[in-house]
Every structure is written in structure tokens, then in C-alpha cells.
């Protein structure tokens, strides 16, 4: 495979890491994989400092991140542990709200416009964050 | 100057295989995610099939989910499209096509730059 | 899917004329949207991206227009070289889909 050593021309470099930060929605699933073609993923926020980066470039604007629980219990896109790593939810989130009338409740995780957090409806078309890690070796496939 | 140049076509009974390629010059190859799309005979385009630069992450239409499998070399620059059980209806001009190199960080992948495209014919 | 509707199939037109194409998705795609020319035995060419960015070395007598999901691809002065097959593409989500395309004859 092969390894990343600077980030893509439109990508910011911040901790070793490219971020992408998009200015028009899409639904939770179709910006996870606008990311994965890009070999990257939703921004997987492990650390205050971190969040602070991310809020700074995207302001005020619900933001989706690479958190869910569309299969039971909460998940960092990229395998991070939930139970242990870094949180910033709003009071009472989440709460997989089921009154806004969609069908279901809320199973994906989105920055709110003062930077916590707010499980909301997967379907909604928020603005996104792509997230890839400098100096990771590629998932290329070896060659046979 | 960009290059797309895509070979492999054929004709080939139904059930049988093909191996498409595309070979790419003129950028950075590994840095871009590539498409296969394709176009029956008096129809219009559809797409088949992506892979993102590394090759580590793979889409395909539920046309041909299972059968068809697209991969890169990238020390080689170049994209395959390996089709299986193939069927009368895989007739078509197929394309590869490269996202982002023009058309860049958008928040969509567009189609930027096409091969000329290669013939694959499934008939008994 | 994400159907994309194309409207008219066909239009005769002349020289100089103004040409307009609409594509209509069944769901809502916001502006993700690209128009393609095709000349028969050719490859597509990108000609609008986003609804209405027209793309590098594209003559601005072609522009795009809409979001949501109803979209124009306008041709303001028609030259000879625009006589072509045109189709749209949602790159909302996958998988990704294409307008049936609409022939732009000579009158």
C-alpha cells in the first residue's frame, strides 16, 4: 500500500490529519460514502481540541460527523471506541426523538450551530466533514 | 494531457467472463477515484461501478453486484473491470471515467474525464 | 433510485436558436446535478456540474440552472458543433443515474 504524506489540494491539514469540510448538505449515508470514495471518513472527533478545529471551519451549521446507531449502540465510523472516547452532546442527547413525524427516531450524530452534539434523522441533508490520516498506510489491496 | 484508453471488449456467450481495462496517463493516478459506466446499444448512460484511489473502497450498481468486480493497479495506472455471468443485458459501450481531476472537492463525484470506450457483446 | 426524467426526448432547432432541456429527479438532490454532451460514437463531455458550474473550456453560451429537483440546461445561441444528445446525472447518491438524454436536431 501506499502512504498519504500531505493532504489533497481543497483539504486541511491540521494534527496529522486532512479534513474536507463540504458547504451543501446530503444525507448521512451519502456523505459517508462521498468520504469513502475519497479514502477517507466523517470526521471522527476524539478530543476537545479537535472539536475546537472542526467548529471553527464550520460555524454555526448543522454538520453531520461520522457517528451513528443505526445498528444498536453508538459508532466512530473508523472503529473508535464510543464507550470511552471523547463526547460533547447537547443536554439530553441524544434521545432518538421520534416526534418530528419521519418515521423512527434519530440515529446519526450532527455538530448543532454552538459545536455540541444532537442525534437527529439520517436523511436530513446537513453539510458534512471528511476526515483522512496523514502517514496511514492505504487499504490498496496487494497485488497478487 | 489526460488519457483514458479502455480495451478487452468482446463477444462473449452468456455466462461467460471478460476483463476490461483502462489504461490512464497524463495524472496522478492514485490520487483519484474512477468510475465504469456503460451504454446498451440506443441507450442511455448508466453507471456500473467506483473505486476510490487506493482501491480500499469499492460501489457498484445492484445491476451488477456479485458479479462484477472493479479493482486498480496503481503501480501499473491502470482500472479493471472483471465481469462475470454475464448476460444479454451487459451489451453496451463500456466507459471508464475519472472523478475530481477538473472537478474538484464539489462534494459530488462528476465524471471529468471519459475513455473513448470498448464494445462488449453477450449473445449465443 | 433516483429516477432522472429528461424533457423533451427530442427538439428541432436552428442556428442561433435558444435551446432549453429539463431534467426533473424523483427525489430531492439538492444541487447535485451534471449536464453531459454526447456525439454519436463519442464519449460524454462534462459540460455542467452543480446544477449551474459550468466546466473549464465550456463556451458560456451553455449554463445551468435549479436545485432541489427540477433543473434546466439552457443552449442560448445554438452553434453548429451543439448539435448533440444531452443528458443530465444526480450525483446525490448512489447509485448514481442518469436523464435518458434529449436529441438536439437540426430544423
Known amino acids: 500500500g501506499s502512504e498519504r504524506t500531505c493532504c489533497p489540494v481543497n483539504w486541511v491539514e491540521h494534527e496529522r490529519s486532512c479534513y474536507w469540510f463540504s458547504r451543501s448538505g446530503k444525507a448521512w449515508a451519502d456523505a459517508d460514502n462521498y468520504c469513502r470514495l475519497e479514502d477517507a471518513h466523517l470526521v471522527v472527533v476524539t478530543s476537545w481540541e479537535e472539536q475546537k478545529f472542526v467548529q471553527h471551519h464550520i460555524g454555526p451549521v448543522n454538520t453531520w460527523m461520522g457517528l451513528h446507531d443505526q445498528n444498536g449502540p453508538w459508532k466512530w465510523v473508523d472503529g473508535t471506541d464510543y464507550e470511552t472516547g471523547f463526547k460533547n452532546w447537547r443536554p439530553e442527547q441524544p434521545d432518538d426523538w421520534y416526534g418530528h413525524g419521519l418515521g423512527g427516531g434519530e440515529d446519526c450524530a450532527h455538530f448543532t450551530d454552538d459545536g455540541r452534539w444532537n442525534d437527529d434523522v439520517c436523511q436530513r441533508p446537513y453539510r458534512w466533514v471528511c476526515e483522512t490520516e496523514l502517514d496511514k498506510a492505504s487499504q490498496e489491496p496487494p497485488l497478487l | 494531457e489526460v488519457q483514458l484508453l479502455e480495451s478487452g471488449g468482446g463477444l462473449v456467450q452468456p455466462g461467460g467472463s471478460l476483463r476490461l481495462s483502462c489504461a490512464a496517463s497524463?495524472?496522478?493516478?492514485?490520487?483519484?477515484?474512477m468510475s465504469w459506466v456503460r451504454q446498451a446499444p440506443g441507450r442511455g448512460l448508466e453507471w456500473v461501478s467506483a473505486i476510490s484511489g487506493s482501491g480500499g473502497n469499492t460501489f457498484y450498481a445492484d445491476s451488477v453486484k456479485g458479479r462484477f468486480t472493479i479493482s486498480r493497479d496503481n503501480s501499473k495506472n491502470t482500472l479493471y473491470l472483471q465481469m462475470n455471468s454475464l448476460r444479454a443485458e451487459d451489451t453496451a459501450v463500456y466507459y471508464c471515467?475519472?472523478?475530481?481531476?477538473?472537478?474538484?472537492?464539489?462534494?459530488?463525484?462528476?465524471?471529468?474525464?471519459w475513455g473513448q470506450g470498448t464494445l462488449a457483446t453477450v449473445s449465443s | 433510485d433516483i429516477q432522472m426524467t429528461q424533457s423533451p426526448s427530442s427538439v428541432s432547432a436552428s442556428i442561433g436558436d435558444r435551446v432549453t432541456i429539463t431534467c426533473r429527479a424523483s427525489q430531492f438532490i439538492s444541487s447535485w446535478l451534471a449536464w453531459y454532451q454526447q456525439k454519436p460514437g463519442k464519449a460524454p463531455k462534462l459540460l455542467i456540474y452543480t446544477a449551474s458550474s459550468l466546466q473549464s473550456g465550456v463556451p458560456s453560451r451553455f449554463s445551468g440552472s435549479g436545485s432541489g429537483t427540477d433543473f434546466t440546461l439552457t443552449i442560448s445561441s445554438l452553434q453548429p458543433e451543439d448539435f448533440a444528445t444531452y443528458c443530465c446525472q444526480q450525483a446525490n447518491s448512489f447509485p448514481w443515474t442518469f436523464g435518458q438524454g434529449t436529441k438536439v436536431e437540426f430544423n
Open positions: 471515467a475519472i472523478h475530481g481531476i477538473a472537478v474538484a472537492g464539489t462534494g459530488a463525484h462528476y465524471f471529468d474525464y
Open positions: 497524463g495524472f496522478t493516478f492514485s490520487s483519484y477515484a
